[in-house]
Interface confidence: medium
């Protein structure tokens, strides 16, 4: 927890942020909570960003005050107005851009006092991988595909049966730039697979880690995938 010391005037209140990541082109959330106030009109929320002259967003007297908002955020920010009264100052950021990455400050004023906390926001691209059997290949082959990643991730294969085995010699990974020239499609092929085994394709960069599993038996194929953001930690 970061308490807003160092601001002269009223008492300090506790403001809490959570470091998070935004997926380019999608909407993101910059998380911030504070000790709530009973009166909405007494709450002021300010979002600032390092390297931006002017505010990212301001909410006060029950509404947005955006007349002096920096151009790069115009039309892209909103708070959850109905949740401010219960202490939610989180900022919704529409159409996340690579340049939105950086350090933000959530600055809160209420009748109880003032406080602030910083938040590290990373941006990139991440997506769920899908693993399929490649029936076009001459030998038993698995194909792992994920449509959007940035920065370029690493891809590692693993298997339940051969735990600890290094599959780099029997796999081939390629990265294909998508049409917007930032994100890339990840394709990794694993050769010489055996049935009655579960294989995992793990894709990871400094923002996210995603895994696609496939279980191949003589009678069926089962798939499962999940994605985890790596830098979500509270301040």
């Amino acid at each position: 927890l970061i308490i807003g010391f160092g601001i002269s005037g009223r008492h300090s209140i506790t403001v809490t942020t959570v470091a998070s990541a935004g997926n380019i082109g999608e909407d993101g959330i910059l998380s911030c909570t504070f000790e709530p106030d009973i009166k909405l009109s007494d709450i002021v929320i300010q979002w600032l960003k390092e390297g931006v002259l002017g505010l990212v967003h301001e909410f006060k007297e029950g509404k947005d005050e955006l007349s002096e908002q920096d151009e790069m955020f115009r039309g892209r920010t909103a708070v959850f107005a109905d949740q401010v009264i219960v202490g939610n100052a989180s900022l919704r950021l529409k159409n996340v851009q690579l340049t939105d990455a950086g350090t933000y400050k959530c600055y809160i004023i209420t009748s109880k006092g003032k406080g602030n906390a910083n938040l590290e926001y990373k941006t990139g691209a991440f997506s769920m991988p899908e693993v399929n059997v490649d029936y076009n290949a001459s030998s038993e082959t698995l194909r792992c595909e994920a449509p959007r990643w940035f920065p370029q991730p690493t891809v590692v294969w693993a298997s339940q049966v051969d735990q600890g085995a290094n599959f780099s010699e029997v796999s081939n990974t390629s990265f294909e730039l998508n049409s917007e020239n930032v994100t890339m499609k990840v394709v990794s092929v694993l050769y010489n697979v055996t049935i009655n085994n579960t294989y995992s394709c793990m894709i990871e960069n400094d923002i996210a880690k995603a895994t696609g599993d496939i279980k191949v038996t003589e009678s069926e194929i089962k798939r499962r995938s999940h994605l985890q953001l790596l830098n979500s930690k509270a301040s």
């Epitope: 601001i7 005037g9 009223r10 600032l48 390297g51 002259l53 007297e61 004023i109 910083n118």
Partner: antibody, heavy 126, light 113 residues
Amino acid sequence: QVQLQESGPGLVKPSETLSLTCTVSTGSISSSSYYWGWIRQPPGKGLEWIGTIYFSGSTYYNPSLKSRVTISVDTSKNQFSLKLTSVTAADTAVYYCARLRVTMVRGVIIGVFDFWGQGTLVTVSS
Amino acid sequence: DIVMTQSPDSLAVSLGERATINCKSSQSVLYSSNNKNYLAWYQQKPGQPPKLLIYWASTRESGVPDRFSGSGSGTDFTLTISSLQAEDVAVYYCQQYYSTPPTFGQGTKVEIK
């Protein structure tokens, strides 16, 4: 376009308190996304930041003057004020109020001054 | 505190000629995480308050003529007036807003030769 106007006595005796007020017109001091500050300029010399205030009352002071400075705000009058105690001849200067367009670096709120008052000369002399 | 040192203290330039003012900071005002220089330039005409010209070392404030340009990075910065006009006679100040307290240079007086 925002306008700022300083007012207060032009002559203050040594050891007394210098008091100035800045009135902001064209726009409300409490409904904009700006901070407000005081800067001074001794005759024929450079500029020195004194301190900054937000409409809520949050203040940031120059460490070199912190023990003697108080900046306050009166949103009902659209004004903010400067008090500088125990003045000496070294405090003789043109005092400006200004609007601060804020940014943040390493967690500290700071910025550039985009609109200034005309300034008022305060002479410290007995 | 970061000390800002300007050079020269004054310069005289013919109308239509280029004027160049330098500003050096005692420590870098370049923030590596966003690659921005936290430096501004102001113009102060006789009997008037300062006027913001440039911020982020090279971004012109709205309404400032394009004959004014800023350059430099880290600790060394330059304000250039590409073609001096009579109305440019003034004292010019640099200011760092990288760390608190914000500090100004001592000023450079620009006159017509």
